[in-house]
């Protein structure tokens, strides 16, 4: 019994990991600016799911920054007060309040580029960013519910005589946990203090022609499967293989 | 309701184990971990390690892997500590407390049980 | 291991007196958890979810904090708070529960 997914439901597609950071953005280029300008303001707010440890870059509005007055992103972290990073064109300064964070920065000068960055996205990163972009034609924001994502560790061992246990330890949100074919199953749910999930689904398989169960094991980082043959023996442990 | 029942007190020869029990009532007894935490006179208090009573899976700090053993018997859900070689360290309360669930730690727990090693 | 250091050890306030107490987290945390015992009882769960109180907690009490620092405040001390309160956490892979030393709160 996973937790909900987001209303989006994004399903990030795992791929080789690369030595270097691995970086995710929403931020459109010049061509798609033109083409979704109108589109872009009315969608406000966006969910967005980012894999932990990776990079993050998050975009204001697509207006030009010559037409720009005063840039502000507004940051509201769990149990912190709110941290506002503003920039003013016109005496080209910048001004941080409450913001303590150092791996939330600008992508670069905020005269020059008013994207903001999280390098090494962690748990503590989930809340709320908005930009907010004044202008001569008025206000426009743009906000993102960042989600983190955090890869269960997936497990899947024999504890006893015909009954298999598969762990998805400390994923963030919930795994779903479901076997093939189905058992006479349980399933615990135990949410730590770093914001993680661990779910345990043992199983029990009283028909004797099943010899081989797989466990798989849902989750927005990317999908899992393990196999393991059930052993006759009682108390036999047995390690799982993957798919 | 949630129920954890502990006797009250244990003496104890130095070099003897002792078992210690923690019978529970008013909820599913395989639907959450029990957990074992000590308490010296006077002092704070330790996790020494938990136990699923639907599979008997242990984790325990590894302080005290060499000291305590965690079983159940789910027939009478009942959780067991066994502790072995005494010594006047191990003279604390010994506390079983329920978790599991929405809640990061531990929202019941039993009275605790007093071990006293004494010669 | 995430090694909870609160303080002061021990503390002791006047009844109407504000009173704070801390705890650090060697590593970064989502949630805290709080425990209050009195002398010769078992500990009670007393704040959870780093500021929601448990049942029958009185309102004068408040948790707040994030990362690495936390801090439990009774807004206006009373003869009833006297006790021991600890912070809690229960996290990593192998797990592993901690508590913190612990806050003895005496009244003057």
């Known amino acids: 019994e996973g937790a909900a997914q987001p209303n989006n439901s994004l399903m990030l597609q795992t791929s080789k990991e690369n030595h270097a950071l691995a970086s995710s953005s929403l931020c459109m280029d010049e061509k798609q600016i033109t083409q979704n300008y109108s589109k872009v303001l009315a969608e406000v707010n966006t969910s967005w799911p980012v894999k932990m440890a990776t990079n993050a870059v998050l975009c204001c509005p697509p207006i030009a920054l010559r037409n720009l007055i005063i840039i502000t992103w507004e940051i509201i972290l769990r149990g912190q007060p709110s941290c506002t990073k503003a920039y003013k064109k016109e005496t080209n300064e910048t001004k941080e309040t409450n913001c303590t964070d150092e791996r939330i920065t600008w992508v670069s000068r905020p005269d020059q580029n008013s994207d903001l960055q999280i390098r090494t996205v962690a748990i503590t990163h989930d809340g709320y960013y908005r930009c907010i972009m004044v202008t001569p034609d008025g206000n426009f924001h743009r906000g993102y519910h960042l989600q983190v994502l955090v890869t269960p560790e997936v497990t899947l061992f024999q504890n006893r005589n015909r009954t298999a246990v598969c762990k998805a330890v400390a994923g963030k949100p919930a795994a779903h946990i479901s076997w093939i074919p189905e058992g006479d199953c349980a399933t615990k749910q135990e949410y730590w203090s770093n914001g993680t999930v661990t779910v345990k689904s043992t199983c029990h398989w009283e028909v004797h022609n099943v010899s081989t169960v797989t466990c798989h094991v849902s989750h927005l980082t990317g999908n899992k499967s393990l196999y393991i043959e059930l052993l006759p023996v009682p108390g036999a442990k047995k390690s799982a293989k993957l798919y | 309701q949630v129920q954890l029942q502990q006797p009250g007190a244990e003496l104890v020869k130095p070099g003897a184990p002792v078992k210690l029990s923690c019978k529970a009532s008013?909820?599913?007894?395989?639907?959450?971990?029990m957990n074992w935490v000590k308490q010296r006179p006077g002092r704070g208090l330790e996790w020494i390690g938990r136990i699923d009573p639907s599979d008997s899976e242990t984790h325990y700090n590894q302080k005290f892997k060499d000291k305590a053993t965690l079983t159940v018997d789910k027939s009478s859900s009942t959780a067991y500590i066994q502790l072995s070689s005494l010594t006047s360290e191990d003279s604390a309360v010994y506390y079983c407390?329920?978790?599991?669930?929405?809640?990061?730690?531990?929202?019941?727990w039993g009275q605790g049980t007093l071990v006293t090693v004494s010669a | 291991e995430n090694v909870l250091t609160q303080s002061p050890a021990i503390m002791s306030a006047s009844p109407g007196e504000k009173v704070t107490m801390t705890c650090s987290a060697s590593s970064s945390l989502s949630y805290m958890l709080w425990y209050q015992q009195k002398s010769s009882t078992s500990p009670k769960l007393w704040i959870y979810?780093?500021?929601k109180l448990a049942s029958g907690v009185p309102g004068r009490f408040s948790g707040s904090g994030s990362g690495n620092s936390y801090s439990l405040t009774i807004s206006s001390m009373e003869a009833e708070d006297v006790g021991t309160y600890y912070c809690?956490?229960?996290?990593?892979?192998?797990?592993?529960?901690?508590f913190g030393g612990g806050t003895k709160l005496e009244i003057k």
């Open positions: 407390a329920r978790s599991g669930g929405w809640l990061p730690g531990f929202a019941y």
């Open positions: 008013g909820y599913t007894f395989t639907s959450y971990w």
């Open positions: 809690f956490q229960g996290s990593g892979n192998p797990l592993m529960y901690t």
């Open positions: 979810d780093t500021s």
